[in-house]
């Protein structure tokens, strides 16, 4: 199913590169190279001029969602698709445009009072409470942070960065996504390009903190492309 690659607990053998490229609105995390799943990477090169590849909704813009471009298509080649307007078919909330949510397979306008009640019944802030407290519906919902009573602390399972407390972002870790610290000056970060064949990256780092950008470390300029170390540096 498409849902399997989109939210917290997905473990992937086929997804495109994780993490957004510079300037892409949905970019919240960067993926650390070198911590890979065993087995070959079946994801092949996606040309620069094709739509932006993704592995999950949060890598796309606010008016997009992540899915295979063709019905029943290869789950390993997913791209950011335009969100679906009111009364269009959907499978999960993220497919619907802002101000709407998915109800009974159709995008409908968010009735805040109804939706808030629904969320309060099904969402738990941390999976430290184990998944026995959650039902299948709640694990696939995509929520704005104001739907939560509390923000996730470091180590809490999350769906989006807005679920995490200040100074944290929601980043993939193996088969789940947890709140991790935003990177500080001097910390190693991962710079992504929009094209190229990548190994499967399943450990994501957060983005660099405010006033910092992910750049090649000065003393690494002479190194080969494959070993260039990027760190968070002042603009």
């Amino acid at each position: 199913t498409l849902n399997s690659v989109l939210n917290s607990n997905a473990i992937k053998n086929l997804p495109p590169p994780l993490g957004g490229a510079a300037g892409h609105p949905g970019s919240a995390v960067s993926a650390a190279p070198g911590i890979l799943y065993p087995g070959g990477n079946k994801y092949q090169t996606i040309d620069n001029y094709q739509p932006y590849p993704c592995a999950e909704d949060e890598e796309c813009g606010t008016d997009e969602y992540c899915a295979s471009p063709t019905r029943g298509g290869d789950a390993g080649v997913q791209i950011c698709l335009a969100c679906r307007k009111r009364r269009k078919r959907c499978m999960r909330h993220a497919m619907c445009c802002p101000g709407n949510y998915c109800k009974n397979g159709i995008c409908v306008s968010s009735d805040q009072n109804h939706f808030r009640g629904e969320i309060e019944e099904t969402i738990t802030e941390s999976f430290g409470n184990d998944h026995s407290t959650l039902d299948g519906y709640s694990r696939r919902t995509t929520l704005s942070s104001k739907m939560y009573h509390t923000k996730g602390q470091e180590g809490s399972v999350c769906l989006r960065s807005s679920d995490c407390a200040s100074g944290l972002c929601c980043a993939r870790h193996f088969w789940s996504k947890i709140c991790k610290p935003v990177l500080k000056e001097g910390q190693v970060c991962t710079k992504h390009r929009r094209k190229g064949s990548h190994g499967l990256e399943i450990f994501q780092r957060c983005y660099c903190g405010e006033g910092l950008s992910c750049r090649i470390q000065k003393d690494h300029h002479q190194a080969s492309n494959s070993s260039r170390l990027h760190t968070c540096q002042r603009h």
Epitope: T1, N3, S4, V5, S8, N9, A10, I11, K12, N13, L14, I35, L36, Y37, P38, A75, F127, G128, D130, H131, S132, L134, D135, G136, R139, R140, E154, G155, V157, H173, F174, W175, S176, I178, I202, F203
Partner: antibody, heavy 117, light 107 residues
Framework: QVQLVQSGAEVKKPGSSVKVSCKAS????????MHWVRQAPGQGLEWMGV????????SYNQKFKGRVTITADKSTSTAYMELSSLRSEDTAVYYC??????????WGQGTLVTVSS | DIQMTQSPSSLSASVGDRVTITCRAS??????LNWYQQKPGKAPKLLIY???RLHSGVPSRFSGSGSGTDFTFTISSLQPEDIATYYC?????????FGQGTKLEIK
């Protein structure tokens, strides 16, 4: 309440295969990954691999060099772990574990597999 | 693979004692450390995840600390039902690996 019920004990000959099942209930089977961990008698715990039941994606511990295969049947909410080319060192209790975050929260009761000629 | 080394391998303590178990990783694992309790003939049980976060339903006498390569698991006041083997587990890098265990007995 999450419940994982595993199949019964098995006695196998060296060189043969064993397939252990793990039936899940109390949650939506496709929502959580299922891991397999083994424990040889008097020994520690060893992670074997994991499956995402929603699409069948798997990842294995390379130590088992293609001897282990993990599958899942969504229709019966059951995960399976098959270990081939059995040797005496594979005598162990095999556990399934259903989980959400990077930790193993819910466990099956364990299945003892004895490999003996 | 990352090696996890626990110490001591066994220890004996009295009810009410403060008990400490250490776990050392062969490389930096940040906070990606979990602790499990296993009683004879039973499956392991998650106690602490992400270094120091208490799993649901776990008594507050259990705690975890440390970072990087050195971690500590503490039982502030040992109870008879705490007799078990305790395992640390790293989930920083695949494959997840466990320590060899610490067997805790009552004096």
């Amino acid at each position: 309440q999450v419940q994982l019920v595993q199949s019964g004990a098995e006695v196998k000959k060296p060189g043969s295969s064993v397939k252990v099942s793990c039936k899940a209930s109390g949650y939506t089977f496709t929502e959580y990954t299922m891991h397999w961990v083994r424990q040889a008698p008097g020994q520690g715990l060893e992670w074997m691999g994991v499956i995402d039941p929603s699409n069948g994606d798997t990842s294995y511990n390379q130590k088992f060099k293609g001897r282990v295969t993990i599958t899942a049947d969504k229709s019966t909410s059951t995960a399976y772990m098959e270990l081939s080319s059995l040797r005496s060192e594979d005598t162990a209790v095999y556990y399934c574990s259903s989980t959400t975050g990077p930790w193993f929260a819910s466990w099956g009761q364990g299945t003892l597999v004895t490999v003996s000629s | 693979d990352i090696q996890m080394t626990q110490s001591p391998s066994s220890l004996s303590a009295s009810v009410g004692d403060r008990v400490t178990i250490t776990c050392r990783a062969s490389q930096d694992i940040s906070n990606y450390l979990n602790w499990y309790q296993q009683k004879p003939g039973k499956a392991p049980k998650l106690l602490i995840y992400y270094k120091s976060r208490l799993h649901s339903g776990v008594p507050s006498r259990f705690s975890g600390s440390g970072s990087g390569t050195d971690f500590t698991f503490t039982i502030s006041s040992l109870q008879p039902e705490d007799i078990a083997t305790y395992y640390c587990q790293q989930v920083h890098t695949l494959p997840p690996t466990f320590g060899q265990g610490t067997k805790l007995e009552i004096k």
